[in-house]
Interface confidence: low
């Protein structure tokens, strides 16, 4: 698998992974003890036909072109977890691995 | 996890899974021996804020609202394989499980 990496200076218009630091304090998410911020990344850009398509299914739907099907969109195709210390709903402190918090790769699906 | 199922008569505008039969013969994909057609399904519809969001990451990016980030889009969140008989690039006949050929669930990511 392959995905483009960009930054805020990139002129790339196609589907790409951009850096993004999420700051929980800035959001007022005070129920998260640690980390207070982390590198989440995000996906943005255009999905031209066949570019970075993760699944053969995406190509097939494009071929079949059913009513109402949008073109593929730029979305995470590989994500990874982070470990977090946080309060659950019972005010207990939990240490756990939270899935799909970091975008490792972007693609068109 | 939860996802909506719709059909061509549905009035649902939100992100939904729709039925779609892919016909390889109609595409001229003569390198696929079997099946000649299969139920692939596809995703279509609007992703209002928080509706059917698969990952907490999607919500966080929406909060952070970086330059160029589009809203979440309606995309497969669960897919399954099908068994296929097909030619590889060396004209050999292969029987194999091809991943991510069927959309089982749609969501916003």
């Amino acid at each position: 698998d392959f995905g483009l990496d960009c930054d805020e200076h990139s002129t790339e218009s196609r589907c790409c992974r951009y850096p993004l630091t999420v700051d929980f304090e800035a959001f007022g998410w005070d129920w998260i003890i640690a980390p207070k911020r982390y590198k989440a990344n995000y996906c943005s850009g255009e999905c031209e036909f066949v570019f970075l398509q993760k699944y053969p299914h995406t190509h097939l739907v494009h071929q079949a072109n059913p009513r109402g099907s949008a073109g593929p969109c730029c979305t995470p195709t590989k994500m990874s977890p982070i470990n977090m210390l946080y309060f659950n709903g019972k005010e207990q402190i939990i240490y756990g691995k939270i899935p799909a918090m970091v975008v490792d790769r972007c693609g068109c699906s | 996890d939860f996802g909506l199922d719709c059909d061509e008569h549905s009035t649902e505008s939100r992100c939904c899974r729709y039925p779609l039969t892919v016909d390889f013969e109609a595409f001229g994909w003569d390198w696929i021996i079997a099946p000649k057609r299969y139920k692939a399904n596809y995703c279509s519809g609007e992703c209002e804020f928080v509706f059917l969001q698969k990952y907490p990451h999607t919500h966080l990016v929406h909060q952070a609202n970086p330059r160029g980030s589009a809203g979440p889009c309606c995309t497969p969140t669960k897919m399954s394989p099908i068994n296929m008989l097909y030619f590889n690039g060396k004209e050999q006949i292969i029987y194999g499980k091809i991943p991510a050929m069927v959309v089982d669930r749609c969501g916003c990511s």
Epitope: V50 | F27, G28, D30, I33, F87, K90, E91
Partner: antibody, heavy 124, light 107 residues
């Protein structure tokens, strides 16, 4: 070496049928799609359809679908193209061509070997 | 069906000239285009596939370019054996369709 040898020229009356053969040698006949293309005198090339000898599955150009049948005989490594209800505008050279598949996508192929062609003349 | 339009339909050139033939598809065919050479009374011969890849054994004076809807075949230095008719073919979808041909003649 890989070779496709076609049957000889035919003269047919309008309304008749013709069956052109294409004998393959030098490769595994069942593993490659065989296509048929025709060319009217002084005209361009027109794709008629194809057949996969491994299982006999064929795809036809809609223009010929009602009149054409493509078959294979794997025991003799021969492909056949039968065209029925012949008209004068079916007068053409009919070619078989082997599809060579080089990639992994649906259109990753090209015609690498052609038969010498069979002239079919339709005249009353 | 996808229409393939070749231009020019005929072309006069001299030995050692550089010539370009174009082929236009009525819709996007990605890079799924082949070029053929045909001499009178002979079967077509494949030159280029996937728009720009040279078939084994074909001299490098032949080159192809383009993607989407617009494609070109270039012969860099014409030799007497290159005077023939050239066809493009789209193999992006069935039915396969050919261009109407370009007849390359000696000036």
């Amino acid at each position: 070496q890989v070779q496709l040898v076609q049957s000889g020229a035919e003269v047919k009356k309008p309304g008749a049928s013709v069956k052109v053969s294409c004998k393959a040698s030098g490769y595994s006949f069942t593993g490659y799609f065989m296509h048929w293309v025709r060319q009217a005198p002084g005209q361009g090339l027109e794709w008629m359809g194809n057949i996969y000898p491994y299982n006999g599955v064929s795809n036809y150009n809609q223009r010929f679908k009602a009149r054409v049948t493509m078959t294979t005989d794997t025991s003799t490594s021969t492909a056949y193209m039968e065209l029925r209800s012949l008209r004068s505008d079916d007068t053409a050279v009919y070619y078989c061509a082997r599809r060579y598949y080089y990639g992994t996508g649906p259109a990753d192929w090209y015609f690498d070997v052609w038969g010498q062609g069979t002239l079919v003349t339709v005249s009353s | 069906d996808i229409q393939m339009t070749q231009s020019p339909s005929s072309l006069s050139a001299s030995v050692r000239d550089r010539v370009t033939i174009t082929c236009k598809a009525s819709q996007d065919i990605n890079s799924y285009l082949s070029w053929f050479q045909q001499k009178p009374g002979k079967a077509p011969k494949s030159l280029i596939y996937r728009a720009n890849r040279l078939v084994d054994g074909v001299p490098s004076k032949f080159s192809g370019s383009g993607s989407g809807t617009d494609f070109t075949l270039t012969i860099s230095s014409l030799q007497p054996e290159d005077f023939a008719t050239y066809y493009c073919l789209q193999c992006d979808e069935f039915p396969l369709t050919f261009g109407q041909g370009t007849k390359l003649e000696i000036k």
